[in-house]
Interface confidence: medium
């Protein structure tokens, strides 16, 4: 079957890294500089991605694979194949149209990306606030007052954020 297909379409013999050159009697020609073909049998080579501006080259383009980009320090990738770079903020901030802004009271962000999220409302789980929240950290919920008997002092991890909690000042 392969032999039959090859007789019908000589381009099927062209391996990755080459293209089937119609201008040269369908000879397999190497991809020109700054281009690639990742599969065999291609009639053209694709232009290599250029990582410029805030994009850095993570992997150079080769004749058989495209370049891969990541983002310069201070930025992080978004989208499939790092199609965009978004600037980092500090912990305790979120990115807005006006750049990085501090989290509002009652919210936190413990990462350099993403949005500020409400503190856990410990009372929803019948617990009390053991450690107050900050712009960078969620509150830590402790046992409910009723649970505070001798020997019962384990701290439960914060529950998923549901609505703004209130941190006693």
């Amino acid at each position: 079957f392969e032999r039959t297909r090859s007789l019908q379409d000589p381009c099927s013999n062209c391996p990755a890294g080459t293209f089937c050159d119609n201008n040269r009697n369908q000879i397999c020609s190497p991809c020109p500089p700054n281009s690639f073909s990742s599969a065999g049998g291609q009639r053209t080579c694709d232009i290599c991605r250029q990582c410029k501006g805030v994009f850095r080259t993570r992997k150079e383009c080769s004749s058989t694979s495209n370049a891969e980009c990541d983002c310069t320090p201070g930025f992080h990738c978004l989208g499939a194949g790092c199609s965009m770079c978004e600037q980092d903020c500090k912990q305790g901030q979120e990115l807005t149209k006006k750049g990085c802004k501090d989290c509002c009271f009652g919210t936190f962000n413990d990462q350099k990306r993403g949005i500020c999220r409400p503190w856990t409302n410990c009372s929803l789980d019948g617990k009390s606030v053991l450690v107050n929240g900050t712009k960078e950290r969620d509150v830590v919920c402790g046992p409910s007052p009723a649970d505070l008997s001798p020997g019962a002092s384990s701290v439960t991890p914060p529950a998923p954020a549901r609505e703004p909690g209130h941190s006693p000042q």
Epitope: G53, V54, L78, G79, S83, M84, K97, R113, I115
Partner: nanobody, 123 residues
């Protein structure tokens, strides 16, 4: 090909002015937020200013507020940055970038960048 090309950089004395331009091609310019960044020698990239699709919203980093003005001409596919009262600390390579607004729940990704134009403020 989607492209951004900056121009207008140069050497200027403290207190002087420069106007940077960014020519866009290969995409529908009026559909995108646009942003200016800069990179001082030996430093990281710093967001400077951005402008929404029709030019009605403009935002600036605190250090340039009142001195720099971002504008755009959608008919000419151009983005400008008017820089007045320049200071030594404004010395940097300035880049324009296309904003990738509308990507998922994160709205501030940049997907196309120019090659940069150098501004040197020195006496």
């Amino acid at each position: 090909e989607v492209q951004l090309v900056e121009s207008g950089g140069g050497l200027v004395q403290p207190g002087g002015s420069l106007r940077l331009s960014c020519a866009a091609s290969g995409f529908t310019f009026s559909n995108y937020w646009m942003t200016w960044f800069r990179q001082a020698p030996g430093g990281g990239l710093e967001w400077v200013a951005n402008i929404n699709q029709d030019g009605s919203e403009k935002y600036y980093v605190d250090s340039v507020e009142g001195r720099f003005t971002v504008s755009r001409d959608n008919a000419k596919n151009s983005l400008d940055l008017q820089m007045n009262s320049l200071r030594a600390e404004d010395t940097a390579v300035y880049y324009c970038a296309r904003g990738g607004l509308g990507y998922g729940d994160s709205h501030y990704g940049m997907d196309v960048w120019g090659q940069g134009t150098t501004v040197t403020v020195s006496s």
